[in-house]
């Protein structure tokens, strides 16, 4: 049998946010039902994780031997602390789209571990704020965006923006 440390060396995690409790659940992406040592996990999920606090999970299974896999969960900031904001100026709304992630509340997570991504059509931007210029008037554009903490996606949003009518004579 392999060790659990080897078997789960590349385990990945998804973070799910509960807006009522303001706590995260970490979903362990494994095929079999694992055990989590001191941290109880139900159906491969570790519950009630506080934003920006690390949690250590010891992963084991009867198909592998000691030592267990010690997984450090880097819990992201609370999702409600981020808002996707349309920053398009009214006078330029016929040919321009501006989108920005606003941080409406501080948090203790290291901001340097946060990555922002926008995809508008086939254009991809790794920025917190984007401005698309020279667009067609009266066209619908869809932009998808996500935020990652330590390369784990923890929130996403989409905006469909229709550019204004062009000025007469344009």
């Amino acid at each position: 049998k392999p060790t659990c440390d080897e078997k789960y060396a590349n385990i990945t995690v998804d973070y799910l946010y509960n807006k009522e409790t303001k706590l995260f659940t970490a979903k362990l992406n494994v095929n079999e039902k694992v055990e989590c040592g001191n941290n109880t996990c139900t159906n491969n999920e570790v519950h009630n994780l506080t934003e920006c606090k690390n949690a250590s999970v010891s992963i084991s299974h009867n198909s592998c031997t000691a030592p267990d896999k010690t997984l450090i969960l880097d819990v992201p900031p609370g999702v409600e602390k981020f808002q996707l904001h349309d920053c398009t100026q009214v006078e330029k709304a016929d040919t321009t789209i501006c989108l920005k992630w606003k941080n409406i509340e501080t948090f203790t997570c290291d901001t340097q571990n946060i990555t922002y991504r926008f995809q508008c059509g086939n254009m991809i931007f790794d920025n917190k704020e984007i401005k698309l210029e020279n667009l067609e008037p009266e066209h619908e554009y869809k932009c998808d965006s996500e935020i990652l903490y330590n390369n784990h996606k923890f929130t996403n949003a989409s905006k469909i923006i229709k550019t204004d009518f062009g000025s007469p004579g344009e």
Epitope: K100, N103, T106, K128
Partner: antibody, heavy 119, light 113 residues
């Protein structure tokens, strides 16, 4: 190491122009709003310009509006302050400072660059 | 504009003593979102300012717990429970509630008695 390094400060005559630069390193510059703050010879701190992470929004106090322009080049990790129609009261140490968002705080400051406006 | 007035201008203290600095705003700096964006910065001789406190009472990471901030509306206070030699310098309050018209207080110089 997170660092901000200002340059471009000089002695300039009243009515003259000057461009300051601030080189950022050790962090994802394009995710941070940035500001210029100056310190007068009397040691007063004055905020003089603000720019959002992508350069979309800029703000100035009335004292410098129309004379100063803040800009950034995220590809070069550099912040700029173009100053024109300089007055003697613009004499100061100019600092660039990082602010993650408007509702955050200035958590990283540069060492400053000195601008002297005198004939 | 929001005027931030600090008192005293100069504060002579003995090491180990408590120090208290007041900051008063000319109008309320409670934002419509309910938060108060009042910050305190310390500038030591020959250095750039460093953040101590944000949102009235939150200590920035690495700031010793002898520093505490309090207040509401227009009146705010920074307290240092036991002054140490490394605390000497000029303290500035700052309001970030009235975006984009940020303003600093005039500064309070903490010095040895």
């Amino acid at each position: 190491e997170v660092q901000l390094v200002e340059s471009g400060g000089d002695l300039v005559k009243p009515g003259g122009s000057l461009k300051l630069s601030c080189a950022a390193s050790g962090f994802a510059f394009s995710n941070y709003d940035m500001s210029w703050v100056r310190q007068t010879p009397e040691k007063r701190l004055e905020w003089v310009a603000y720019i959002s992470s992508g350069g979309v929004s800029t703000y100035y106090p009335d004292t410098v509006k129309g004379r100063f322009t803040i800009s950034r080049d995220n590809a070069k990790n550099t912040l700029y302050l173009q100053m024109s129609s300089l007055k003697s009261e613009d004499t100061a140490m100019y600092y660039c400072a990082r602010r993650y968002d408007v509702w955050w705080y200035f958590d990283v400051w540069g060492a400053g660059t000195t601008v002297t406006v005198s004939s | 504009d929001v005027l931030m007035t600090q008192t005293p201008l100069s504060l002579p203290v003995s090491l180990g003593d408590q120090a208290s600095i007041s900051c008063r705003s000319s109008q309320s700096i409670v934002h419509s979102n309910g938060n108060t964006y009042l910050e305190w910065y310390l500038q030591k001789p020959g250095q750039s300012p460093k953040l101590l406190i944000y949102k009235v009472s939150n200590r920035f990471s690495g700031v010793p717990d002898r520093f505490s901030g309090s207040g509401s509306g227009t009146d705010f206070t920074l307290k240092i429970s036991r002054v140490e030699a490394e605390d000497l310098g000029v303290y500035y309050c700052f309001q970030g509630s009235h975006v984009p018209m940020y303003t600093f207080g005039g500064g309070t110089k903490l010095e040895i008695k």
